[in-house]
């Protein structure tokens, strides 16, 4: 069996979708003639070397665009970035590439994505909307960290 990424669509609890704008992912209310991104995700093949009970470690990319989500420090602040990267290249590496990995946890229909490189930091969108995706440590406050992930088959 050849492993391939799964495809999915994401929206938050306020029904905002992820859109690519100037190489940045932003969350906006769904409208007609809008093109939300399709997510590509694949589980890390080295799952046994990562923390257990934190969620399923996955690489997250944008389907068909050779762009992947990664976490890097800018100054002292972990930030979320889009990097030109083939998700399968990350998948095949001999070790987990932790800056590109997220622990995916599901509770009911809600999904969270926690940075493997920066434990305790989650992908989030500002409650205001129309803002870029960020990383946050503050759950359930000014930022939304719960997302609905629908797999596309």
């Amino acid at each position: 069996k050849i492993d391939t990424p799964q495809r999915g669509s994401i929206q938050d609890i306020n029904h905002r979708v992820w859109v690519l704008q100037d190489q940045t992912l932003i969350a906006v209310p769904r409208k007609d003639r809008m093109s939300p991104v399709t997510i590509a995700l694949i589980s890390c093949r080295h799952v046994e070397t990562l923390e257990k009970d934190r969620g399923n470690p996955i690489y997250l990319g944008l389907n068909g665009l050779n762009l992947c989500l990664m976490c890097a420090k800018v100054g002292d602040q972990p930030t979320l970035q889009l990097k030109e990267k083939d998700i399968m290249d990350l998948y095949n590496q001999p070790e987990p590439v932790k800056s590109f990995l997220f622990y995916h946890s599901q509770s009911g229909r809600n999904s969270t994505f926690e940075s493997v490189a920066f434990p305790g930091w989650f992908i989030a969108v500002s409650s205001e909307g129309g803002c870029p995706l960020i990383l946050t440590q503050e759950l359930g406050k000014a930022n939304t960290t719960d997302f609905g992930l629908t797999m596309l088959f």
Partner: antibody, heavy 121, light 109 residues
Framework: QVQLVQSGAEVKKPGASVKVSCKAS????????IHWVRQAPGQGLEWIGR????????RYDPKFQGRATITTDTSTSTVYLEFSSLRSEDTAVYYC??????????????WGQGTLVTVSS | QAVVTQEPSLTVSPGGTVTLTCRSS?????????ANWVQEKPGQLFAGLIG???DRAPGVPARFSGSLLGGKAALTLSGAQPEDEAIYFC?????????FGGGTKLTVL
């Protein structure tokens, strides 16, 4: 600058254990993987195993599983290799090395100076 | 477990080109083996040269290049310098462990 500094030479008797240390500086060991490799006299390099210092998970060459134990103390940025049930053929220089992801790939980029372990009765 | 074999020794003239190879007993070396090349100079620490078959490590001169050649990993040195005299080791990845070769002693003469 990036440095891996290892502990000094050891002489052990067959059946004994040895614990070698590797102290990292110039980088955060939680951001990399630290490997242990050895070189017996006149031989090539032999991979022993590695640790992810951030999590503590390890991998070993099947040949050394059970005799080698790699641990870390992130508070002092030190990684340890403990080798048990020593035999004369374990006489070698033991190296720690950093496996670091840069750009698109992993590199064994920085190495310690090596620790000579001599096993002799 | 695979055995990784390298030429024991090679000689190159200053300014010349030489190719070192790394063979696996388990079959053709591919990009999935993520070949690494490491240099050991007398009295110096080991230093990483190549990762992922053909990626140069930061600061490594462009005269060093990695590739796949006839089912083997290869390290080519173009325009050899006297300071390139060293032992070169390759390492190959096999799904859950690394295997190093025996090393090639390169003489620049």
């Amino acid at each position: 600058q990036v440095q891996l500094v290892q502990s000094g030479a050891e002489v052990k008797k067959p059946g004994a254990s040895v614990k070698v240390s590797c102290k990292a500086s110039g980088f955060n060991i939680k951001d990399t993987y630290i490997h242990w490799v050895r070189q017996a006299p006149g031989q090539g390099l032999e991979w022993i195993g590695r640790i992810d210092p951030a999590i503590g998970t390890t991998r070993y060459d099947p040949k050394f599983q059970g005799r080698a134990t790699i641990t870390t103390d992130t508070s002092t940025s030190t990684v340890y290799l403990e080798f048990s049930s020593l035999r004369s053929e374990d006489t070698a220089v033991y190296y720690c090395a950093r496996l670091h992801y840069f750009g698109n790939n992993f590199f064994f980029d920085y190495w310690g100076q090596g620790t000579l372990v001599t096993v002799s009765s | 477990q695979a055995v990784v074999t390298q030429e024991p020794s090679l000689t190159v003239s200053p300014g010349g080109t030489v190719t070192l190879t790394c063979r696996s007993s388990s079959g053709a070396v591919t990009t999935s083996n993520y070949a690494n090349w490491v240099q050991e100079k007398p009295g110096q620490l080991f230093a990483g040269l190549i990762g992922g078959t053909n990626d140069r490590a930061p600061g490594v001169p462009a005269r060093f290049s990695g590739s796949l050649l006839g089912g083997k990993a290869a390290l080519t040195l173009s325009g050899a310098q006297p300071e390139d005299e060293a032992i070169y080791f390759c390492a190959l990845w096999f799904s859950n462990h690394w295997v190093f070769g025996g090393g090639t002693k390169l003489t620049v003469l």
